[in-house]
């Protein structure tokens, strides 16, 4: 058997091979050693033996997209069945007083391979053994601790494969410079030891996407608005927009990235090195957001142009210079980069919205009739923008960090928006007091400290100061 | 678009050499490789070889190894070949064409999406 | 080098009908195949990658199938603007190798 006869259902193009060459990695037409790494189709019963107590379960994950050009990481992580764990030996044990539906377990081991390695590890004098093999025949390398290694992988890609030796979790990073743009499938057999050969336990696919263009999320926030996530913005408040590039192999960490940004209102181009903006819009509408991020990424330098062909026999007089063989639009760049850009586009609505709250005054309510520990407190509160139809107090202590009381009421206010708040206190003290206006789109706050005195007893009366 | 501009025609001696220029437009030139294929009057279609555009690597039909040079100019978006040592067998229309690709399932296909308008070479004293 | 073989040379037949060309890999290529159409004095174009999936605008009439070593081209109810020439291409190895073309000519 072949390695994509093992791995694939579909057997790969050698002209798609030679067109995603992958650094380290080998042709899916090798040779597979079927003895010591027996293969099993789907819905095979020994599936079902392969593991003690269950089957063991891959999981597979990369930070796709990748940038072509960039490092992709693949992680797969064992999950092994209930109870049981990968010991620092590498060895398989039951976690102590778990309980399974086979109860707890006498054995504390469900795979010992320490003491299998130890007492039946036949080897020659270079120590390598003859099982001590990738599926191709390629041997193990002995990196310390190599014998507590007990699972091989066998990463497959693009009819090529990587294979590798781990505990119950791996990474393999590829460099996606030859890789097709596009997504592509990763697919991941897991072997277990088992005396001198290796079983089957696990198999896992999963898409990852190689793209051309730099991936671009961008994240929107403004003060008061209510919901950053529904794309509807606050007229006259500035909005916060902030690039982040999914580049998590750092393959663009010495580019110089230009964003360019167009809001959609006539306020022509803004251009930024840095990825975070302000801006603000002055009308009320619907606006299309477009931005354009450059990169000049590293990219690989083209050879150099072949000589000139040798004239068959001496010219008289020079050519144009057009026919020079590098002419001046071929010289690569010293460092030979290549631009790459990428694309962000929103459609944002920008409506009316209340831009700001103020208590003007605070005032200690006259009770005729005190209450044993209350005090009333009126604040008087203006704002600016449109008109709240909600009032939210929330009274919590000096650091404002523990809520002490939270009320929120309907509110009725004019054109002018004066409204008086007034709210009840527990007892003298300092109090931090979070006063929110909002209406349907926005959410204004203020904030103030204020200090309730302690309540004279003989007087039924008192005035704020 | 995506569009693939060459020259419409170059008449040579021969002996002499030709280069041959593409000119691509309407997508990210160094993301594909580019084909050249060559037809001679009244024939049918002959590959000569493929470029990466991005990296320069290059794969030669064995026959035309020794005849056509393929480069690229990645800051002008130009595929070029060289055709050298001409002969009355080299007139002929040399197209280039963009390798394009599909996602498969597991692997990506290949086909030639885009062709140029192909360059009349005519070999002649 | 695989050998890419079409038949029929040539054909000729009537507005409206429909016709088959097909074409033979002389060994497996496992469905890594398209098909081109070139009308005179013009370029070819694409008009079916991965043995049976039209590229994008192909008209529906045209249908790919096929596998393993033996492929076909179908046009149904042929149109005035079909003829010209056709031409299948493997993707297996390199290099990639034409057919020698199918000529469509009108009855």
């Known amino acids: 058997k072949r390695f994509h006869d093992v791995l694939g259902n579909e057997r790969p193009s050698a002209y798609m091979r030679e067109h995603n060459q992958l650094n380290g990695w080998s042709s899916d037409e090798n040779d597979w050693n079927e003895k010591l790494y027996p293969v099993w189709k789907r819905g095979d019963m020994r599936w079902k033996n392969s593991w003690k107590g269950g089957r063991v379960q891959a999981v597979l994950t990369s930070d796709s997209p990748a940038l072509v050009g960039s490092n992709i990481t693949f992680v797969v992580n064992l999950v092994f069945p209930r109870c049981q764990k990968e010991d620092a030996n590498g060895n398989i044990v039951y976690e102590k007083n778990c309980r399974n539906e086979a109860g707890l377990s006498a054995d504390p081991y469900v795979y010992n391979w320490t003491a299998w390695s130890e007492d039946s590890d036949g080897e020659n004098g270079t120590g390598q053994s003859h099982h001590n093999v990738f599926p191709d025949g390629k041997p193990f390398p002995h990196h310390p601790g190599w014998r507590r290694w007990n699972f091989v992988y066998v990463f497959h890609t693009l009819g090529q494969y990587f294979q590798k030796l781990g505990r119950c979790s791996v990474r393999v990073s590829v460099n996606t410079a030859n890789v097709t743009l596009g997504p592509q499938l990763m697919e991941v057999t897991v072997y277990r030891r088992h005396g001198r050969a290796y079983v089957p336990i696990a198999q896992v696919k999963d898409v990852y996407v190689v793209t051309d263009q730099i991936p671009v999320f961008v994240t929107m926030s403004q003060k008061n608005d209510r919901n950053s996530s529904d794309e509807t913005f606050l007229k006259d408040l500035p909005i916060t927009f902030d690039v982040l590039i999914h580049d998590p192999s750092h393959f663009l960490n010495y580019s110089t990235i230009n964003y360019k940004w167009s809001f959609g209102d006539n306020t022509g181009l803004f251009v930024s090195i840095n990825h975070t903006v302000n801006h603000t819009y002055v009308l009320n509408g619907t606006f299309s957001l477009n931005l354009t991020v450059k990169a000049a990424a590293p990219g690989p330098c083209p050879p150099p142009p072949p000589p000139p062909p040798r004239p068959p026999k001496p010219t008289p007089s020079l050519g144009p210079a057009g026919d020079n063989p590098l002419g001046l639009s071929e010289i690569p760049d010293e460092n030979c980069q290549i631009n790459r850009y990428g694309h962000f586009q929103a459609t944002i609505t920008i409506v009316e919205g209340i831009l700001e709250v103020n208590i003007i005054q605070t005032t200690d309510v006259l009770m005729l009739v005190p209450g044993p520990d209350s005090s009333l407190i009126d604040f008087v509160v203006t704002c600016q923008g449109s008109i709240p139809t909600e009032v939210c107090t929330i009274i919590s202590d000096p650091t404002c960090e523990i809520t002490q009381n939270a009320v929120c009421s309907p509110v009725d206010v004019d054109e002018m928006c004066l409204l008086t708040v007034r709210r009840a206190f527990n007892g003298s003290g300092t109090y931090c007091v979070n006063l929110t206006l909002g209406d349907d789109t926005s959410l204004a706050l203020t904030s103030t400290l204020i200090s309730v005195p302690d309540r004279d007893p003989a007087s039924s009366l008192r005035m704020a100061n | 678009q995506v569009q693939l501009q060459q020259p419409g025609a170059e008449l040579v001696k021969p002996g002499a050499s030709v280069k041959l220029s593409c000119k691509a437009s309407?997508?990210?030139?160094?993301?594909?490789?580019m084909h050249w294929v060559k037809q001679r009057p009244g024939q049918g279609l002959e590959w000569i070889g493929e470029?990466?555009?991005?990296?320069?690597?290059?794969n030669y039909n064995e026959k035309f190894k020794t005849k056509a040079t393929l480069t690229v100019d990645r800051s002008s978006s130009t595929a070029y070949m060289q055709l050298s040592s001409l002969t009355s067998e080299d007139s002929a229309v040399y197209y280039c064409?963009?390798?394009?690709?599909?996602?498969?399932?597991?692997?990506?296909?290949?086909?030639?999406?885009?062709w140029g308008q192909g360059t009349s070479v005519t070999v002649s004293s | 080098d695989i050998q890419m073989t079409q038949s029929p040379a040539s054909l000729s037949v009537s507005v409206g009908e429909t016709v088959t060309i097909t074409c033979r890999a002389s060994e497996n290529i496992y469905s890594n195949l398209a098909w081109y159409q070139q009308k005179q004095g013009k370029s070819p174009q694409l008009l079916v990658y991965a043995a049976t999936n039209l590229a994008d605008g192909v008209p529906s009439r045209f249908s790919g199938s096929g596998s393993g070593t033996q492929y076909s081209l179908k046009i149904n109810s042929l149109q005035s603007e079909d003829f010209g020439s056709y031409y299948c291409q493997h993707f297996w190895n390199t290099p990639p190798t034409f057919g020698g073309g199918t000529k469509l000519e009108i009855k």
């Open positions: 309407g997508y990210t030139f160094t993301s594909y490789w």
């Open positions: 064409a963009r390798l394009g690709y599909y996602s498969g399932s597991p692997y990506p296909y290949y086909a030639m999406d885009c």
């Open positions: 470029i990466n555009s991005s990296n320069g690597r290059t």
